[in-house]
């Protein structure tokens, strides 16, 4: 009951983890900036890892889509990928998962193969987290060490004067959304992990000794008695006695260092 | 390499008018605030005009009802239609533009133009 507590809460929560990484990567709010050396006070700019905006107290909001690709710095082009793989990682962990899910019933798919499809799925889905959290990382970096207050250098450019436009960066909502979601994604794949040493059957076998009696022939059949799982050929956990209805060879066992007691 | 060209300065009589335009061209990603600064000669450089890209405007208080500015977003240029001109406008009119660039959408410069001599006398 535990483990199937356990297994459920994982995905639940990687299924969450998922959608909010999904969204952080749709964002337009990955850094917020305000232009405050401008006479236009209420002009607002965000950017995402798509498209750039500007906002204005007027209620005007323009976006642009970055349409170059080779162009663009190759730090966002990385985060790009770092998020993109993550919400690949995190759908095929989903869709294993589900089919892994102690409470869903596939054919007579064993417990030790939903216990393998559960481990695969944890395992995704921490790489899935891992990877938003390091995109969202390397972005949030990208914006302290580069930008988090651009000074106003003046240089002569080609048409005249040059100024960095005195900008202060700011974290926009969809870092903070990554980093939730990464980290719900990383503890989702860490519970079906432990999930899945639950579901893993324990192949524990006790093995049987064949005893020659006398009398009538009684023969205990190695895997008689097995861990209580359920698991391996004799269900049921009982001791097999056949009676003497077999032929020569089956009644012949092996000699072993019991068989003269 | 972005540049903001600036025309139509010239010599005009007081109570005259005027157009300026000012382009910008280069590898632009997109032009956030575009305005006019002037300087007269012994002076400091001032705000005359500016507008967004939603077109809200501010003006200097001197140019208030006698200057007009607008922008052509596709174009990347902005325009200012100056009538009523006085004496004391006279100056080198620059063009100003806060953009970013195609190569680094994250980053805002503010270009300048290399200014266009506006002369009001009689």
């Known amino acids: 009951m535990a483990v199937t507590a356990c297994q459920g809460l994982g995905f639940v929560v990687s299924l969450i983890g998922i959608a909010g990484i999904i969204a952080a990567t749709c964002m337009d709010q990955w850094s917020t900036q305000d232009l405050y050396n401008n006479p236009v006070t209420a002009v607002f700019n965000y950017q995402g890892l798509w498209r750039s905006c500007v906002r204005e107290s007027s209620g005007f909001t323009e976006c642009r889509g970055y349409f170059t690709l080779l162009g663009l710095p190759a730090m966002l082009q990385a985060v790009r990928a770092l998020m993109i793989v993550g919400i690949v990682l995190g759908a095929i962990g989903l869709l294993v998962s589900i089919f892994a899910l102690k409470c869903i019933r596939i054919g007579s798919m064993e417990d030790s193969a939903k216990a393998n499809m559960t481990l695969t799925s944890g395992i995704m889905f921490i790489v899935s987290g891992l990877c938003a959290i390091a995109g969202v990382s390397v972005f949030a970096n990208m914006l302290v060490t580069n930008f988090w207050m651009s000074t106003a250098n003046m240089y002569t450019g080609m048409g005249g004067m040059v100024q960095t436009v005195q900008t202060r960066y700011t974290f926009g909502a969809a870092l903070f959304v990554g980093w939730v979601a990464g980290g719900l994604t990383l503890i989702g794949g860490v519970m079906m992990c432990i999930a899945c040493r639950g579901l893993a059957p324990e192949e524990t076998n006790y093995k049987a000794v064949s005893y020659h009696a006398s009398g009538h022939s009684v023969a205990y059949k190695p895997g008689g008695f097995k861990a209580s799982t359920g698991f391996g050929s004799n269900t049921k956990n009982k001791k097999i006695y056949d009676g003497g209805a077999r032929t020569e060879d089956e009644v012949q066992s092996y000699p072993s260092k019991h068989d003269y007691v | 390499q972005v540049q903001l060209v600036e025309s139509g300065g010239g010599l005009v009589q007081p109570g005259g008018s005027l157009r300026l335009s000012c382009a910008a061209s280069?590898?632009?990603?997109?032009?956030?605030?575009m305005g006019w600064y002037r300087q007269a000669p012994g002076k400091q450089r001032e705000l005359v005009a500016v507008?967004?890209?939603?077109?809200?405007?501010n003006y200097a208080d001197s140019v208030k009802g006698r200057f007009t500015i607008s922008r052509d977003n596709a174009k990347n240029t902005v325009y200012l239609q100056m009538n009523s001109l006085k004496p004391e406008d006279t100056a080198v009119y620059y063009c100003?533009?806060?953009?970013?660039?195609?190569?680094?959408?994250?980053?805002?410069?503010?270009?300048w133009g290399q200014g266009t001599l506006v002369t009001v006398s009689s």
């Open positions: 100003n533009a806060d953009l970013n660039l195609a190569s680094d959408p994250f980053k805002w410069y503010t270009y």
């Open positions: 280069g590898s632009i990603f997109m032009i956030n605030v």
């Open positions: 507008i967004t890209r939603g077109a809200s405007t």
